[in-house]
Amino acid sequence: EPTMYGEILSPNYPQAYPSEVEKSWDIEVPEGYGIHLYFTHLDIELSENCAYDSVQIISGDTEEGRLCGQRSSNNPHSPIVEEFQVPYNKLQVIFKSDFSNEERFTGFAAYYVATDINECTDFVDVPCSHFCNNFIGGYFCSCPPEYFLHDDMKNCGVNCSGDVFTALIGEIASPNYPKPYPENSRCEYQIRLEKGFQVVVTLRREDFDVEAADSAGNCLDSLVFVAGDRQFGPYCGHGFPGPLNIETKSNALDIIFQTDLTGQKKGWKLRYHGDPMPCPKEDTPNSVWEPAKAKYVFRDVVQITCLDGFEVVEGRVGATSFYSTCQSNGKWSNSKLKCQPVDCGIPESIENGKVEDPESTLFGSVIRYTCEEPYYYMENGGGGEYHCAGNGSWVNEVLGPELPKCVPVCGVPREPFEEKQRIIGGSDADIKNFPWQVFFDNPWAGGALINEYWVLTAAHVVEGNREPTMYVGSTSVQTSRLAKSKMLTPEHVFIHPGWKLLEVPEGRTNFDNDIALVRLKDPVKMGPTVSPICLPGTSSDYNLMDGDLGLISGWGRTEKRDRAVRLKAARLPVAPLRKCKEVKVEKPTADAEAYVFTPNMICAGGEKGMDSCKGDSGGAFAVQDPNDKTKFYAAGLVSWGPQCGTYGLYTRVKNYVDWIMKTMQENSTPRED
């Protein structure tokens, strides 16, 4: 327990002290006092450096003194023989004696008292930054006006922290600027702007004068800027050493000004303003930015438009442009969106044609459609080449997005007809010579395939049976063979409106307009044995002249049998109509004069007994196309005749081309379009 005074006596004092003793006393006076220790009696064996016996005075780690020998007072008015004054409140006294004493020594008597110390003057380190005030047992620090005493109760500083600046523009200066700034202070200023604005600090070199750095380059007084995880500074010296324009890239900035106890200068002054946060001009491939600017800032909106052939895809839909906003964090919204090549997808397949699997279906890719040659050709031109266009469609230079149409090649037999074996009234033929030949089984007759959906025949063939069964692709019409051939199912029969329907068809004498069309339910697949015949053109080139040759084919009556099982054919010349008129009707059902002959009829035959006959009706009279020798067209249809083996009459198809085209157009299906 600290005491204000006390007495310390050597062992046995005032008797002689014993040998081999060590005793210590810990002196403690109250905090804020020093110790005055004085000896009134000293009688200790003398030795060099007091090595044998001694009294030692220790303050902390320091030996204040070591005493031995005899002392007497120099002052007759004072009993003090030795004294010590320490400015601390603790002291240790240690007495030691060795194993022998040559004489009898009485030791020592000492006293201590607590004494006041002047903390303001007694120490090398001044305890107060500004004013020091001593009192008995302690001291206190005080500050000049406008300064305040820090929590350590020793240091004074100015109250320069806590200011928060939220305006978009402002000015901040060190305390007292341009007068010297306060020492020993830490000033903190906060700038807090709306998100989306960055703080930009501007200084002038001459507006900055802060105590310079020490020899190691460390600022004694310093100005530091902290923006998030970025720091600018510390700065010090005469004239601002940093950039005069600091873009912080942050809406929050802390300014910290730290000063020490010495070397005050005029300080600093700065301006700040809020700049809208910039967003980088990003390189977005395959697109253009609108508006195009050198610099984009917070709240700027750009329209990013993909170049032709590129799009932004979301799920199954795409867009060619989108909007992007420069956001408060300095980044673009929608930066994920990328313009990627348009994908036209797998091209559609076409009837009777194909498209090879494309290597790519992306913008700019090329595909080629082809038709199943030699039976189909591309009707609508364009060459079949399509490229993947910017709108995501496969596009042809001629047709645009319209798909090519593969239509049957007409009038080209796979094998030309040759009259090999001379038989009465004609030759055996193969269906490949007349792939357009259609067989009607009730009545036994013929027809001509003119496209995938239509069969041309004589009106008298279908007037009695509006749902005829037809076959294509077979040379033989034996039942077993027909089972393997292609049967055609009619959807509707269209008889020419000029064909006169009779109660008793057997007595007919007027075969004018003997033409009909049969619309099929399903399209016919073309091949070597099934292929249409062409229709005549409307130009005068297709007007027949006497002597022009044509081919007829069918399974009608021959010289030997009522019906042929295998296809027969003959080549006949066109004859003047009068030649047909001159032939006597074989089994007249009426007066010979009653038979009607019109310009809608062609007369042909009369040579070597070659003629069509019963059962050949409706079959084509095929003539070589005057403009394309590789093709045949249906110049006529087997209609009637005065007598088999002479001349026959054929419906003049050229006169009905308009009716045929109109009927087909009006009764086409979407599948055909």
């Epitope: 709240r299 909106v301 329209q303 932004v312 895809v313 979301e314 799920g315 839909v317 867009a319 989108f322 909007y323 906003t325 956001q327 964090n329 980044k331 919204s333 929608n334 930066s335 994920k336 969106l337």
Partner: antibody
Framework: QVQLVQSGAEVKKPGASVKVSCKAS????????MHWVRQAPEQGLEWMGW????????IYAQKFQGRVTITADTSTNTAYMELSSLRSEDTAVYYC?????????WGQGTLVTVSS | DIQMTQSPKSLSASVGDRVTITCRAS??????LDWYQQKPGQSPKLLIY???YRYSGVPSRFSGSGSGTDFTLTISSLQPEDFATYYC?????????FGQGTKLEIK
Amino acid sequence: QVQLVQSGAEVKKPGASVKVSCKASGFNIKEYYMHWVRQAPEQGLEWMGWIDPENADAIYAQKFQGRVTITADTSTNTAYMELSSLRSEDTAVYYCARSRLFFAYWGQGTLVTVSS
Amino acid sequence: DIQMTQSPKSLSASVGDRVTITCRASQDVRTALDWYQQKPGQSPKLLIYSASYRYSGVPSRFSGSGSGTDFTLTISSLQPEDFATYYCQQQYTTPYTFGQGTKLEIK
């Protein structure tokens, strides 16, 4: 197929926080933006903010700034929305939605009730 | 922030009617406007994006038009399943904002 499945309904006291999850399947959230939209009872839709899970960049509506935190865990393909300092007017159905060009897919919604 | 104002707030119509809902933006949003349909207890569903493009699977009776500040959603012939609340939303700039909604009820 694309699906966003949200966590179940929550009842919270005023001042508390709530964290709603949105688990995505059928796509990778890193390739899209994940938004949060709320709808108070008998009220309209209110956009709260979004996150780009690829880089964790988030943007919030000014109204919710400081109270909402949108995060994403790409390893579990899940987005989260945490709303703090709840008050009674935060009672609403909270939806997550996926976007690139538009909000094509939405979660089923999570009802958060704030009541003392 | 861009404000979106829908009109009318609610409307009654009959099956087969032609219905038009309008949406006005407080500033130009070009064509960055989407329309959503929401039925009670369900999440919103996208109908129209970029002002006029019908989203996949949306019936052709729904159409959108407009650009700048004035937009329209039209239902050409109302079907029973169309009675719901419709919202417009601008995606021109953040924060993305919705209209307050138009409730379509059976007359």
